[in-house]
Interface confidence: low
Amino acid sequence: KPSNEATGNVSHSGMKKEFLHELKAENIKKFLYNFTRTPHLAGTQNNFELAKQIHDQWKEFGLDLVELSHYDVLLSYPNKTHPNYISIINEDGNEIFKTSLSEQPPPGYENISDVVPPYSAFSPQGTPEGDLVYVNYARTEDFFKLEREMKISCSGKIVIARYGKVFRGNMVKNAQLAGAKGMILYSDPADYFVPAVKSYPDGWNLPGGGVQRGNVLNLNGAGDPLTPGYPANEHAYRHELTNAVGLPSIPVHPIGYDDAQKLLEHMGGPAPPDSSWKGGLKVPYNVGPGFAGNFSTQKVKMHIHSYTKVTRIYNVIGTLKGALEPDRYVILGGHRDAWVFGGIDPQSGAAVVHEIVRSFGTLKKKGRRPRRTILFASWDAEEFGLLGSTEWAEEHSRLLQERGVAYINADSSIEGNYTLRVDCTPLMYSLVYNLTKELQSPDEGFEGKSLYDSWKEKSPSPEFIGMPRISKLGSGNDFEVFFQRLGIASGRARYTKNWKTNKVSSYPLYHSVYETYELVVKFYDPTFKYHLTVAQVRGAMVFELANSIVLPFDCQSYAVALKKYADTIYNISMKHPQEMKAYMISFDSLFSAVNNFTDVASKFNQRLQELDKSNPILLRIMNDQLMYLERAFIDPLGLPGRPFYRHIIYAPSSHNKYAGESFPGIYDALFDISSKVNASKAWNEVKRQISIATFTVQAAAETLREVA
């Protein structure tokens, strides 16, 4: 049967109902169980076996084509015979304390081998020894506070920082810039232990021996450190390790709060600068350097023996060919590799993707194909720097930039069970608002109400009254290459915690051995109703993007966002009124471009309302204008010092990879500008960045004009 035909025997809305109805909580639960029986560390046999299993099941589900896509990338592992640890040594060099070599296995998992001990992936080897300095979250502002206000130097010191607030790679980068020779990362109870909740296995809190694994790279979107910009295939030229992108230069190691207590309890030096530096341990949180009083002769020593290795990784790529527009790709992707069991990250997401694939496959078996092609991806090595997704996108960049309609990310489905959390391009705001109005809320107290209703009540927008919050895309997940490098409209959705009452960073057991199937079933989502809701949201996004006659993108939402971002960056700049005047810095051109974009977007929407949708050429023209609008914000030259972050409106914050920054070029040029030695040069760069932003917004507006 020709595949470029139609979309099934029911209407768009009927077909969507059927698709959504096919999604079952019980299946997601079953898939999660299946995906969490063993560890699935990237580059290991277990993860290859899971890739093959998913490949086979996606074929059974009815996808047209499923392939394994492999790359040989730089990964990092601890040395099995030479474990990593940190010790306190006395003046004679004897170890008087050693941190744990591993986490205690959770009940029922005592006999499982292959549990990788806690480590910081890509840490170099080394045995630095010295005084400790406590640097809070190791944010840029924390180091400013230490160095500028407290006059404490980290040069030649080992720094200890608590996880939370920012991406750990940024923490390490900041420590390196401050001159540290080693870094210890730990989980503080203030950030990873919610009061009145028990520790695992009796609750969902982090026990004292629990440790967060994670990579400490600063790739800035490069992908495999040895093949930046190009796929790590057999033909690839590989840099020498000394020229690899983003590797840390100092040894780094993570520990739990029981071990941190021992390292911090005798810290000397000044008290923390303010209470925001105090965590939840019974220690003074003195900054150091070094220990106090009788302990002043003791030092801290790191013992890091991890190694890097070029290792084969495997993505699973499934294709469901579009009936009418097979050359337009809607991508749903999430990673498969886990630090250990991956009960939440990533398998709560992978299980949802699996069920979405099954539902689309069921429709296809009934002859109901999507209008556009849907690509499904099970990415490998996300935990090692988004490597699987980035290498695949690098390999297929020419196709993706020409044909990519949208990318929907599908990592962890839950990080809590309070309300929905969405980050996406403004193009998708309307899509998300509309589809959540059609879904039932799973929340207690919202029976019979829509997901939109519970979401807006629990997470209201700070700008728009009566609407739910949607956040900017940052990074730290597999949408990065699609959005920040290629300019493909992207979005993500998951269920989250109550950020107002629950101050923990992420969820307490994140990247620990205790992130198990039982954690989810016992404490987060016993009935899997939240997983089902996330499946419905992600699935409906993909469904609409793949089946709507007119792409469900709203360029006017982008106009509103651009105005807000221009106001924000202008207000930041206006904190320096004298310099603005002296160096003749004006935002008039940017505001003019934004106004023009707003006008053009409005006219475009008017034409869209009047579009003769029965004319396939006219329809394709306007759909292409919508599809390519995100692409229009890409600058081929990239952002300063970050060539793979090419989106001019959004980039991961230079200070926190997880967070999105608007007008990042201007923001970075303005950041800490008052401390720059050469003010004239600094303000000239602000001027240059304003001109780039102005040109980009103006150029993007031009793409929305009537074609002739």
């Epitope: 099934g8 025997n9 209407s11 002859g367």
Partner: antibody, heavy 123, light 108 residues
Framework: QVQLQESGPGLVKPSETLSLTCTVS??????????WGWIRQTPGRGLEWIGT???????YYNPSLRSRLTLNMDTSKQEFTLRLTSVTAADSAVYYC???????????????WGQGTQVTVSS | DVVMTQSPATLSLPPGERATLSCRAS??????LAWYQQKPGQAPRLLIY???TRATGIPARFSGSGSGTEFTLTISSLQSEDLAVYYC??????????FGGGTKLEIK
């Protein structure tokens, strides 16, 4: 009530293009949410679905006719058209314009039929 | 394509009798099946959709049953105006939507 009325030439020469129009009265394309299609009937082949359209412009074609078939809709005139190129004697049939049961039931059963128009392909 | 086969090709019964018309699909079409009645010189008319749901205005003597591949249209008590050709049509798997070849119902 809703009515469908087919119109077009009763006689078409081989290799030429058959154009038929269906005028819909009593219902608006754009607000009704129905799917509209064409079916033909010959004594030899019985009833044969040709294709279907939605007001938004979605078109659904019988693969056997796909290369020769174009369906269009003019919402302002409340009519939809069939164009079948390179006709042969095998295209001689009674052509019905139809409405699928609905609204929003998609390509379901056909609940409304025009009275049909006989098309003969002959030189 | 899903091939729909109807039997018998012709059915001849006296008024008041029960008529049973069969339709078989070459593969499962679930309950996505419709029945039509076409009287001489007229367009077809929808009788049943969803295998068993009567369309608006259709007399209760017409009933449909079956699912998967085997379907039946039953006319409980034949009347003279039921003289017609009856077609089944599947709308589960497409394109194309396909019809059966028809059963001609004659009144003795």
């Amino acid at each position: 009530q809703v009515q469908l009325q087919e119109s077009g030439p009763g006689l078409v020469k081989p290799s030429e293009t058959l154009s038929l129009t269906c005028t819909v009265s009593g219902a608006s394309f754009s607000s009704s949410g129905y799917y509209w299609g064409w079916i033909r009937q010959t004594p030899g082949r019985g009833l044969e679905w040709i294709g279907t359209m939605f007001y938004s412009g979605a078109t659904y074609y019988n693969p056997s006719l796909r290369s020769r078939l174009t369906l269009n809709m003019d919402t302002s005139k409340q009519e939809f058209t069939l164009r079948l190129t390179s006709v042969t004697a095998a295209d001689s049939a009674v052509y019905y314009c139809v409405r699928h049961r609905g609204p929003d039931s998609g390509l379901d059963a056909f609940d409304l039929w025009g009275q049909g128009t006989q098309v003969t392909v002959s030189s | 394509d899903v091939v729909m086969t109807q039997s018998p090709a012709t059915l001849s019964l006296p008024p008041g009798e029960r008529a049973t018309l069969s339709c078989r699909a070459s593969q499962s079409v679930s309950s996505y099946l419709a029945w039509y009645q076409q009287k001489p010189g007229q367009a077809p008319r929808l009788l049943i959709y969803g295998a068993s749901t009567r369309a608006t205005g259709i007399p209760a003597r017409f009933s449909g049953s079956g699912s998967g591949t085997e379907f039946t249209l039953t006319i409980s008590s034949l009347q003279s105006e039921d003289l017609a050709v009856y077609y089944c049509q599947q709308y589960n798997d497409w394109p194309p939507l396909t019809f059966g070849g028809g059963t001609k119902l004659e009144i003795k």
